[in-house]
């Protein structure tokens, strides 16, 4: 077990803070909840503290919760491939470029680390080149979320990882908006981290609303499990 992994044996409170600017539309989001890495479970609620969110909530899910991949459930035989927990408590910097097909792009930079007993994800997001009447600024996405696989590989030069995946957002007219994600994570501290063999995270997300919440908000339930690395041969012959 890495030292960081010891911090995730129980339920951990999570705080998310985002400052965004998309085509000049500035906004802030605060989120709270908890994560349980034993089950790969996240429960979070987000509010836009600046009024109405200028982009659809589903376009921010990867920035919020795929940001705290340290809560992914890594099976016993894969624990030596869990970069995310091994970087804790000092944490990691997570940078992404998200290309929305036939539309604009988000660039995000986040610091994910422990502050006291709380896992904090502080994010800056800049979005450019979006069409004012497109699927994103035109709010044409359905309020739901598909399952995805998130592919992880080691980046030995930077002592971190590179991550690639393609999100499929459902559009109200029945079509799909693709969002190509290019991600890199580097540790904040200088302690040892686990550099993984290639594998993937399998994610399932459910979006809902709190009927008593007056502010523009999103409630998120997510399950994430690591997969893609088989047991060694010695395991097969036990």
């Amino acid at each position: 077990m890495s030292k960081g992994e010891e911090l995730f044996t129980g339920v951990v409170p999570i705080l998310v803070e985002l400052d965004g600017d998309v085509n000049g539309h500035k906004f802030s989001v605060s989120g709270e909840g908890e994560g349980d890495a034993t089950y790969g479970k996240l429960t979070l609620k987000f509010i836009c503290t600046t009024g109405k969110l200028p982009v659809p909530w589903p376009t921010l899910v990867t920035t919020f919760s795929y940001g705290v991949q340290c809560f992914s459930r890594y099976p016993d035989h894969m624990k030596q491939h869990d970069f995310f927990k091994s970087a804790m408590p000092e944490g990691y910097v997570q940078e992404r470029t998200i290309f929305f097909k036939d539309d604009g792009n988000y660039k995000t930079r986040a610091e994910v680390k422990f502050e006291g007993d709380t896992l904090v994800n502080r994010i800056e997001l800049k979005g450019i080149d979006f069409k004012e009447d497109g699927n994103i600024l035109g709010h044409k996405l359905e309020y739901n979320y598909n399952s995805h696989n998130v592919y992880i590989m080691a980046d030995k030069q930077k002592n971190g990882i590179k991550v690639n995946f393609k999100i499929r957002h459902n559009i109200e007219d029945g079509s799909v908006q693709l969002a190509d994600h290019y991600q890199q994570n580097t540790p904040i501290g200088d302690g040892p981290v686990l550099l993984p063999d290639n594998h993937y995270l399998s994610t399932q997300s459910a979006l809902s609303k709190d009927p008593n919440e007056k502010r523009d908000h999103m409630v998120l339930l997510e399950f994430v499990t690591a997969a893609g690395i088989t047991h060694g041969m010695d395991e097969l012959y036990k």
């Epitope: 709270e32 008593n212 919440e213």
Partner: nanobody, 120 residues
Framework: DVQLVESGGGLVQAGDSLRLSCAAS?????MAWFHQGLGKEREFVGG????????YYADSVKGRFTIDRDNAKNTVSLQMNSLKPEDMGVYYC?????????????????WGRGTQVTVS
């Protein structure tokens, strides 16, 4: 656990002002006021984050009510101006362990017993 005690309620005439106060027995996260009219559900009125940089009001009181807090004294106050008959009811102080200001009553762990406001 944190105890909350409200004060300042009373009988006023429409158009008058009233200031409610809430004292907490210790530090808290976000704090809010909720209003419960006779036979109605408890509804969010206004709230404030621990730093005071995030304040939010229900549409029905915007421009009339003001909320502030004093972290040194663990108090939160609600200044109510231009009171209307529909403002009548019990006002509850509520607090969260954590910092984010939500408006849903289910997000608040600590509650006072309430103070009655009557508008004639």
């Amino acid at each position: 656990d944190v105890q909350l005690v409200e004060s300042g309620g009373g009988l006023v005439q429409a158009g008058d002002s009233l200031r409610l106060s809430c004292a907490a027995s210790g530090p808290t996260g976000a704090m809010a006021w909720f209003h419960q009219g006779l036979g109605k559900e408890r509804e969010f009125v206004g709230g404030i984050s621990p730093s005071g940089d995030n304040i939010y009001y229900a549409d029905s009181v915007k421009g009339r009510f003001t909320i502030d807090r004093d972290n040194a004294k663990n108090t939160v106050s609600l200044q109510m101006n231009s009171l209307k008959p529909e403002d009548m009811g019990v006002y509850y102080c509520a607090a969260r362990r954590r910092v984010t200001l939500f408006t849903s009553r289910t997000d608040y762990e600590f509650w006072g017993r309430g103070t009655q406001v009557t508008v004639s």
